[in-house]
């Protein structure tokens, strides 16, 4: 018996087609992805093949103005239109709190939404009961397939799930649910979830009875043969893991942003054992037409976005200096504003010992692309912020050793004075440079804001200590020459859309007046 699994993950609000790098579509003839194009491809496969499942491994939420405005209603609407068979909850599905998941998505979705390792307690338990499930048994042709969901246990540090959801260890939580499916005579089981490729592989290895793992979170691109676009494969598709009980378990993921549709063919024997598996992600390029009806629906929904772009988010009573003459040479108040917003967006009261789990931010000055003039009645709009942060990136959470941070700050000024983009703006950091010293030895003082303290204060950076830092995904990926970050990071979790982070902060503060306050000094 053959099953075709179509899968997406980490779509992050890319409802419209995008450029090859998943940013805003500029040249339509070269654009990719989007729900209208995905619809066409899915329908083509559904009418050509007998047993097809369309699955999503989480993080539909967050990433473009679509989410900012529609807050998840767009996800439910267009996923319903695509007739998804199941979805696993990702960490970003909790970005607007539990209510922001329940109302727009859980109550509106016409497909099951799954996670076996999220347990509700207190008053939330009855409110959310039945709206998401640990697993679902789906009829496919003449057979049944069990889908069991899972979500990153780091979600409380990455999003806003509140205090009434407990995120258990994925493997511990999955095993009893899979066992339950086995007692229900379900012998074909897919683990669908959002914890990253390393955890996906562990699930394949450790959870007895899981036949296939469909994952997300790490934006992993797998491919067999010559890849069709710019993404470099992290391994073959599917990636085969040998389980502890000796089975070959295919593990798949389909990069991110709706650029590809994962396509996996699985052959099962009559006892539900995987005999063979093969496939590849399908690049959703412009050779695949966008479905005209879905496209028309997208255009109808778009109108509200265009209106939103020009509405006032808040006011500034000072000039927001985002000029390259400032932000690439010295501390600039636009950099301070953005870093303060990044930290504010990551406030999660972890426990009594920590006032927050992260206190530090770094931001390449070259990523700040425009100032905002306060003389326009002080008004700040989404449109204004899009000029400051035009690249559609995310502000991510990483863990780095102190020694890596020191290297990053040395890189920040290794060729100072040439108006290059690697000069770092900061938050929760005090740095002093001596430019008279040779490159690689110019950081003379580097103090960082404590997190394990009731009254935050600045302490000298410790080389061997592990620190959490918020930074643009561009830096996490080694951009602007920050190869040491990419090579030495110990953990990387993708965060929220950059503009959204700053716009939310401005809306929250209502009136802003960021200063230049001595975060960066030259001796």
């Amino acid at each position: 018996w053959e099953l075709t699994i179509l899968h997406t993950n980490d779509v992050h609000s890319r409802l419209e087609q995008t450029s090859e790098d998943s940013s805003k579509c500029v040249n339509a003839s070269r654009c990719m992805g989007g729900v209208a194009r995905l619809f066409t491809k899915v329908q083509q496969i559904r009418r050509a093949e007998p047993n097809v499942l369309l699955l999503d491994a989480g993080d539909q939420y967050q990433g473009t103005i679509w989410f900012t405005v529609y807050k998840g209603a767009e996800v439910a609407h267009f996923m319903n239109a695509l007739r998804y068979d199941a979805m696993a909850l990702g960490n970003h599905e909790f970005d607007n709190g539990v209510e922001g998941l329940i109302e727009p998505l859980l109550k509106e979705a016409k497909f099951p939404i799954l996670s076996a390792n999220i347990k509700a307690k207190g008053p939330l338990a009855s409110q959310i009961s039945g709206l998401y499930l640990p697993y679902k048994v789906l009829p496919v042709g003449d057979e049944v397939v069990g889908i069991v969901g899972y979500t990153s246990k780091e979600t409380p540090f990455l999003s806003n799930p509140g205090t009434n959801l407990v995120f258990e260890d994925e493997i511990t939580a999955l095993q009893p649910e899979v066992d339950k499916l086995k007692t229900l005579n379900v012998n074909k089981i897919i683990a669908l979830g959002h914890s990253g490729f390393e955890t996906d592989k562990l699930i394949a290895q450790k959870v007895r009875g899981v036949d296939v793992v469909v994952g997300g979170h790490s934006n992993t691109f797998l491919y067999t043969g010559n890849p069709p676009s710019k993404e470099v494969p992290a391994g073959k598709y599917p990636f085969i893991v040998t389980s502890d009980d000796g089975r070959k378990v295919p593990v798949v993921q389909a990069y991110a942003f709706g650029k590809y549709l994962g396509y996996l063919k699985i052959e099962f024997d009559e006892r539900g054992n995987v005999i063979s598996s093969h496939g590849n992600p399908i690049l959703l390029n412009s050779s695949i037409p966008e479905d005209p009806s879905i496209k028309a629906d997208i255009n109808k929904w778009r109108i509200k976005l265009d209106n939103y772009s020009t509405q006032e988010l808040g006011k500034t009573i000072v000039y927001l200096d985002g000029s390259s003459q400032s932000c690439r040479f010295r501390e600039c108040n636009m950099g301070n504003l953005i870093c303060d917003a990044m930290i504010n967006n990551n406030l999660r009261h972890a426990d009594e010992m920590f006032w927050n789990h992260v206190s530090m931010c770094i931001l390449n000055g070259g990523g700040i692309r425009s100032p905002i003039d306060e003389r326009n009645n002080g008004t700040i709009t989404w449109e204004n912020l899009a000029a400051v942060l035009p690249f559609g990136g995310t502000f991510d959470l990483v863990q780095l050793k102190g020694s890596t941070l020191k290297k990053a700050f040395e890189h920040s000024v290794h060729r100072y004075g040439q108006s290059t983009g690697e000069f770092l703006q900061v938050g929760g950091i005090h740095v002093v440079y001596d430019l008279s010293r040779k490159p690689g030895d110019r950081v003379v003082k580097l103090d960082v804001l404590c997190t394990k303290c009731r009254v935050p204060s600045y302490d000298p950076l410790k080389m061997d200590e592990i620190y959490k830092v918020i930074l643009p995904n561009f830096l996490a990926n080694g951009g602007d020459g920050f190869q040491m970050i990419k090579d030495e990071l110990l953990r990387h979790d993708s965060g929220d859309q950059d503009i959204n982070v700053v716009s939310t902060y401005i809306s929250k503060m209502k009136v802003i007046y960021p200063a230049v306050e001595g975060r960066i000094k030259f001796s």
């Epitope: 619809f39 559904r46 590849n280």
Partner: antibody
């Protein structure tokens, strides 16, 4: 211009096998499934099966399982169908047709198969 | 599998007349996602392969004369030729293009007096 050029008519004896080919041109061969359709004399159209030229995966109408085998040669953009254990019931016109995104877009000109002793 | 039933099986008309033929499916062909009915009408002239006339139940393929109109939704569909021409002599087939496997109706043979 998209074209599907099928091989010529076949006259074969009962019990034998035959292989019909369909050479595609004018489009990216791997973009669309290739279908095969049977039309007996004066009768309607019957879908035999399809093949995904990307990976050679096949899907068959239950009725034609064991009768037809579909293959592709990507290097020459050619799809083929082998029919075995032929009987007079297999006498028909056979079409290849690629299924684009909305329907069976392009059809070959048809290959007439006559099974007779 | 979805069963497609066409009627009448044959039809003889005079040039210039209006013709309607019916196609019924055993299950709905409406895709709730894009609100399209995945029904295709083909025309097959003698000695030729079938050619698409109408897709999505009512969308005319480019180059098809506007005398051909498709209508209907769900399970009941109609092909209308507003003023039959001599060159319309053919067999007309409907096809389920919604779900696997694709299935064809038995055809309506249109003859011209």
């Amino acid at each position: 211009e998209v074209q599907l050029q099928q091989s010529g008519p076949e006259l074969v004896k009962p019990g034998a096998s035959v292989k019909i080919s369909c050479k595609a041109s004018g489009y990216t061969f791997t973009d669309y499934y290739m279908n095969w359709v049977k039309q007996s004399h004066g009768k309607s159209l019957e879908w035999i099966g399809n093949i995904n030229p990307n990976n050679g995966d096949t899907n068959y109408n239950q009725k034609f399982k064991g009768k037809a085998t579909l293959t592709v040669d990507k290097s020459s953009s050619t799809a083929s169908m082998e029919l075995r254990s032929l009987t007079s019931e297999d006498s028909a016109v056979y079409y290849c047709a690629n299924s684009g995104y909305y329907y069976f877009d392009y059809w070959g000109q048809g290959t007439t198969l006559t099974v007779s002793s | 599998d979805i069963v497609m039933t066409q009627s009448p099986s044959s039809l003889t008309v005079t040039a210039g007349e209006k013709v309607t033929m019916s196609c019924k499916s055993s299950q709905s062909l409406l895709n709730s996602g894009n609100q399209k009915n995945y029904l295709t009408w083909y025309q097959q002239k003698p000695g030729q392969p079938p050619k698409v006339l109408i897709y999505w139940a009512s969308t005319r393929e480019s180059g098809v004369p506007d005398r051909f109109t498709g209508s209907g939704s769900g399970t009941d569909f109609t092909l209308t030729i507003s003023s039959v021409q001599a060159e319309d002599l053919a067999v007309y087939y409907c096809q389920n293009d919604y779900s696997y496997p694709p299935t064809f109706g038995g055809g309506t043979n249109l003859e011209i007096k």
